[in-house]
């Protein structure tokens, strides 16, 4: 389906508003340090050019690829070399190498100031004064901080952001109306970004076979009544959508995502009974709804899997005839029967089944060899079940903050070379699994917990890849996508690690501690905890608990004092000395 002008094709398909939003997101994800005004100028230039191509598809340059057009535009930025250093070298390359070069320079941890939320009245005034600029600023600020954010979904977030302001800036109590909505958008946005980052890592580091396997498992759980051929079609289309978005082809991605939503809604009967309420919604909401749709009910009469995949004498014949199709069917059949399993577990089972067939199909009596293959699954199933059970018990016993601390200690001991901010961020997020998943019924706990942990551990892998410091982290991150979580779980105390020298400055606190929000206070304390473990990796839980309790008491005491700074100056060194003694 070729078009004389790709840019005109996408402009017409998407409409001006979505076209401009997606180009802004694309540019902001590539040039993360550029000022807002610069990006708006570039977007306007691209949009004006697109309009000329809509009017006349054979006009000059309209036949160029989107990568060529966008890359040429990005390379006009005057301060490219000063702001981005070696990224400017990308501009000397030809497509497709130039785009690959830009992709490689995307920064998952850009050095950007945290977003500060202004007063509600200030935000409402800005919203009313220039709604369009206000919403563009939102797209820009999110996209540059999250360079792999799923672009069509970010347009949906922007629509919700706009709706929140439109409603709440009229309300009697603007803050009470707006702030919870903004908090929800922030938290959902961070989760959405992290989930998409795992999809992109899966595609980029492990190839589309890995992503397709993930998609077969997940879609088979969601749509257990759909035929394998239907699931395969959805998987192929979904893979194309995510490959495009992860590759920076945001216009194609959004267009194909809309086509997929259309297809799903036109074929509900052969997909799922749960799609109906999604399909009545407008495009952005519809696509979001379809992505988040709950699992359909499992068909009542599903036969045992053993007949086709263990008892049959034709297993190796079927495997030889089309390995990936046969394994895909196995994964589909297993997943549709097990909404209670995590996707990662299902992929491990498929991998184990494949390994058994590779070994057994070469035997003289394959059937005798693979007859007990399902028994080999038992330990693979029990491992995440036990892990979830133990960690949910610990979470219920400790509460979120102390559960996070337990994980901070656990992970710092495993990989003490990792930077403290990364350990704090990752462990805090790992700790959120408790509140997110442990309250769910048994059948939903494992898919919630393990698939969430995969997303969080991917963040560790992505940050670690930028500055590699631990061979163990590299090994867990690169060897197998599906075994990342078990790999990290299996890590023990790093005996080779040379403890960090004690630095009193790290444990020196000031009166500004008292004005911090509860979350910021927690982060300060957790930073200190990581540093303690790096200094004394063999400290016991009891020792660390004692130090942290003293720390909390010391901070509370000084924050209640009349002269807070004097208290910190006096009590701080005492706390440090007492801590060193306690850990000696």
């Amino acid at each position: 389906d070729t078009h004389k002008s790709e840019v005109a094709h996408r402009f017409k398909d998407l409409g001006e508003e979505h076209f401009k939003g997606l180009v802004l997101v694309a540019f902001s994800q590539y040039l993360q340090q550029c000022p807002f005004e610069e990006h708006v100028k570039l977007v306007n230039e691209v949009t004006e050019f697109a309009k000329t191509c809509v009017a006349d598809e054979s006009a000059e340059n309209c036949d160029k690829s989107l990568h060529t057009l966008f890359g040429d535009k990005l390379c006009t930025v005057a301060t490219l070399r000063e702001t981005y250093g070696e990224m400017a070298d990308c501009c000397a390359k030809q497509e497709p190498e130039r785009n690959e070069c830009f992709l490689q320079h995307k920064d998952d941890n850009p050095n950007l100031p945290p977003l500060v939320r202004p007063e509600v009245d200030v935000m409402c005034t800005a919203f009313h004064d220039n709604e369009a600029t206000f919403l563009k600023k939102y797209l820009y600020e999110v996209a540059r901080r999250h360079p792999y954010f799923y672009a069509p979904e970010l347009l949906f977030f922007a629509a919700r952001y706009k709706a929140a302001f439109a409603e709440c800036c009229q309300a009697a109590d603007k803050a009470a109306c707006l702030l919870p909505k903004l908090d929800e958008l922030r938290d959902e946005g961070k989760a959405s970004s992290a989930k998409q980052r795992l999809k992109c890592a899966s595609l980029q580091k492990f190839g589309d076979r890995a992503f397709k396997a993930w998609a077969v498992a997940r879609l088979s759980q969601k749509f257990p009544k759909a035929e394998f051929a239907e699931v395969s079609k959805l998987v192929t289309d979904l893979t194309k959508v995510h490959t495009e978005c992860c590759h920076g082809d945001l216009l194609e991605c959004a267009d194909d995502r809309a086509d997929l939503a259309k297809y799903m809604c036109e074929n509900q009967d052969s997909i799922s009974s749960k799609l109906k309420e999604c399909c009545d919604k407008p495009l952005l909401e519809k696509s979001h709804c379809l992505a988040e749709v709950e699992n359909d009910e499992m068909p009542a009469d599903l036969p045992s899997l053993a007949a086709d995949y263990v008892e049959s004498k034709d297993v190796c014949k079927n495997y030889a005839e089309a390995k990936d199709v046969f394994l895909g069917m196995f994964l589909y059949e297993y997943a549709r029967r097990h909404p209670d399993y995590s996707v990662m577990l299902l992929l491990r089972l498929a991998k184990a089944y494949e390994a058994t067939l590779e070994k057994c199909c070469a035997a003289a009596d394959p059937h005798e060899c693979y007859a007990k293959v399902f028994d080999e699954f038992q330990p693979l199933v029990e491992e995440p079940q036990n892990l979830v059970k133990q960690n949910c018990e610990l979470f219920e016993q400790l509460g979120e903050y102390k559960f996070q601390n337990a994980l901070l200690v656990r992970y710092t001991k495993k990989v003490p070379q990792v930077s403290t901010p990364t350990l704090v961020e990752v462990s805090r997020n790992l700790g959120k699994v408790g509140a997110k998943c442990c309250k769910l019924p048994e059948a939903k706990r494992m898919p919630c917990a393990e698939d969430y942990l995969s997303v969080v551990l991917n963040r560790l892998c992505v940050l670690h890849e930028k500055t590699p410091v631990s061979e163990k982290v590299t090994k867990c991150c690169t060897e197998s996508l599906v075994n990342r979580r078990p790999c990290f779980s299996a890590l023990e105390l790093d005996e080779a690690y040379v403890p960090k020298a004690f630095n009193a400055e790290t444990f020196t606190f000031h009166a500004d501690m008292c004005t911090l929000s509860e979350k910021e206070k927690q982060v300060k304390k957790q930073t200190a905890l990581v540093e303690l473990v790096k200094h004394k990796p063999k400290a016991t839980k009891e020792q660390l608990k004692g130090v942290m309790d003293n720390f909390a008491a010391f901070v509370e005491k000084c924050c209640k004092a009349d002269d807070k700074e004097a208290c910190f100056a006096e009590e701080g060194p005492k706390f440090v000395a007492a801590s060193q003694a306690a850990l000696a």
Epitope: K313, D314, V315, C316, K317, Y319, A320, E321, E358, C361, A362, A363, A364, D365, P366, H367
Partner: nanobody
Amino acid sequence: QVQLVESGGGLVQPGGSLRLSCAASGFTFGSFGMSWVRQAPGKGPEWVSAIDGGGADTRYAESVKGRFTISRDNAKKTLYLQMNSLKPEDTAVYYCTIGGSTSRGSQGTQVTVSS
């Protein structure tokens, strides 16, 4: 796609010999155990012999043990069945299969033992 083509069958007198071949394509031949299966007129398939992917492990049905020898040449992607001391009850269509399958996925080759 997977293709198995058998050859070497024919009419032979009792006590005679034949060597059957099965040329394979469309899959990684050396990674799969192979079998010979036969089907006499009006009867179900009967497994005859099997060999592992490397050619080291061979198995035979009691009815052919000591008379038939299975072998393979992975470089040529070919499976063989050397049949000696043939008996009238060996008359059947012989076909090769992947793994332990007894499903017929090819034409097979007719072996007739008669005086």
